[in-house]
């Protein structure tokens, strides 16, 4: 049994880091493998992650972490029984994938304006809370070409757009994702999408 693709990990910079790797053949990850991880810190304790299958030869492990900060560094040991298959390290702050925003809501009761709001996925005491920027994707269910991205570079988790910038009388969907420049993160996953019917009063034409 050998590791074909070494583990690569990303952290949500809050409580979970996800590591993925591939073995050289079909593997029952949860019964055959264990990923041991330990913070390089005084008094830290070793933890064991039981991986799940991720395709035939792929494995994924969700590492639970407390109080993640930029100085943290973890040692990782991948074991198959008594055999050490791979040894490495992981610094969460250098491989951040933010959590996806939640509670995306479209408020259509403001005159001729669409107000999209969502929730910041981090608590106020997390460093990322004040450092997320967002991308909002709006698309038409009827017209695949009607697809647009709005970059929200301010901190408030909301976006206002004129209803007239979208076609009237058809349904649209929206979703939002986040990233943080300060840690050069990847984009988060998209939030679940929300749907609304866009209708507004066309201006009277002479």
């Amino acid at each position: 049994m050998k590791v074909l693709q070494e583990p690569t990990c990303v952290s949500d910079y809050m409580s979970i880091s996800t590591c993925e790797w591939k073995m050289n053949g079909p593997t029952n990850c949860s019964t055959e493998l264990r990923l041991l991880y330990q913070l390089v810190f005084l008094l830290s304790e070793a933890h064991t992650c039981i991986p799940e299958n991720n395709g035939g030869a792929g494995c994924v492990c969700h590492l639970l972490m407390d109080d993640v900060v930029s100085a943290d560094n973890y040692t990782l040991d991948l074991w198959a029984g008594q055999q050490l298959l791979w040894k490495g390290s992981f610094k969460p702050s250098e491989h951040v994938k933010p959590r996806a925003p939640g509670n995306l809501t479209v408020h259509t009761n403001v005159s001729d304006t669409l107000l999209l709001t969502w929730s910041n996925p981090y608590p106020p005491d997390n460093y990322l809370y004040n450092h997320l920027t967002y991308a909002v994707n709006i698309w038409s269910e009827n017209d695949p070409a009607d697809f647009r991205i709005y970059n929200v570079t301010y901190l408030e988790p909301s976006l206002r757009i004129a209803a007239s910038t979208l076609k009237s009388g058809i349904s649209y969907r929206a979703r939002v994702r986040a990233w943080a420049q300060c840690y050069n993160t990847t984009w988060s996953e998209w939030s679940p999408s929300t749907k609304w019917h866009n209708s507004y009063r066309e201006p009277f034409e002479q």
Partner: antibody, heavy 116, light 111 residues
Framework: QVQLVQSGAEVKKPGASVKVSCKAS????????MHWARQAPGQGLEWMGI????????SYAQKFQGRVTMTRDTSTSTVYMELSSLRSEDTAVYYC?????????WGNGTLVTVSS | LPVLTQPPSVSAAPGQKVTISCSGG????????VSWYQQLPGAAPKLLIY???KRPSGIPDRFSGFRSGTSATLAITGLQTGDEADYYC????????????FGTGTKLTVL
């Protein structure tokens, strides 16, 4: 919100021991390390040691080795610092502080006076 | 513990900018991250800056931190009378043992 509430002021005789408590609330107690530091009157801050509330393991500043003991009670989310063989120079305000590499939140402090 | 040296006192008028230095050895400041604490008269210390330059939520951006080599600096702009306090730098050291030294402390007086 996070709160670290410490026990009240103590007056002790030289050679005695003192045990200071720090009750934590507003966060997952076992997820954060706890430091202890002290401050003698008119002096600066001095680090004493650290405890991991999850397993109870401890590490102490060399200056206090053999005299200090840090413990925790997870059922009450409380950490304790006991200092023995007290001398007059141990008169200080003792603080607990939550954190790992730095101290996010500090207790209100406990004044320990050592006097004959 | 390793010694982190700060000036005993600094002073400036309201609205001005003041800086407080913190110098230490390569095994402490040089290899780790610096934090800064504010201690108002009669109160417990409070975290102002961590990780060299990050502010906890609720700390105004008038406070900033910077580290270069084996020294660090706390800068306070737009001084207010309420900033009059003692300021301590802090870090951690892993050699030969883990420990958390604090700076000698600086008394800030707002004139």
């Amino acid at each position: 919100q996070v709160q670290l509430v410490q026990s009240g002021a103590e007056v002790k005789k030289p050679g005695a021991s003192v045990k200071v408590s720090c009750k934590a609330s507003g966060y997952a107690f076992t997820s954060y390390y706890m430091h202890w530091a002290r401050q003698a009157p008119g002096q600066g801050l001095e680090w004493m040691g650290i405890i991991n509330p999850s397993g109870g393991s401890t590490s102490y500043a060399q200056k206090f080795q053999g005299r200090v003991t840090m413990t925790r009670d997870t059922s009450t989310s409380t950490v304790y610092m006991e200092l023995s063989s007290l001398r007059s120079e141990d008169t200080a305000v003792y603080y607990c502080a939550r954190g790992k590499y730095w101290m996010y939140d500090w207790g209100n402090g406990t004044l320990v006076t050592v006097s004959s | 513990l390793p010694v982190l040296t700060q000036p005993p006192s600094v002073s400036a008028a309201p609205g001005q900018k003041v800086t407080i230095s913190c110098s230490g050895g390569s095994s402490s400041i040089g290899n780790s991250y610096v934090s800064w604490y504010q201690q108002l008269p009669g109160a417990a210390p409070k975290l102002l800056i961590y990780d060299n330059n990050k502010r906890p939520s609720g700390i105004p951006d008038r406070f900033s931190g910077f580290r270069s080599g084996t020294s660090a600096t706390l800068a306070i702009t737009g001084l207010q009378t309420g900033d009059e306090a003692d300021y301590y730098c802090g870090t951690w050291d892993t050699s030969p043992v883990w420990e958390w030294p604090f700076g000698t402390g600086t008394k800030l007086t707002v004139l």
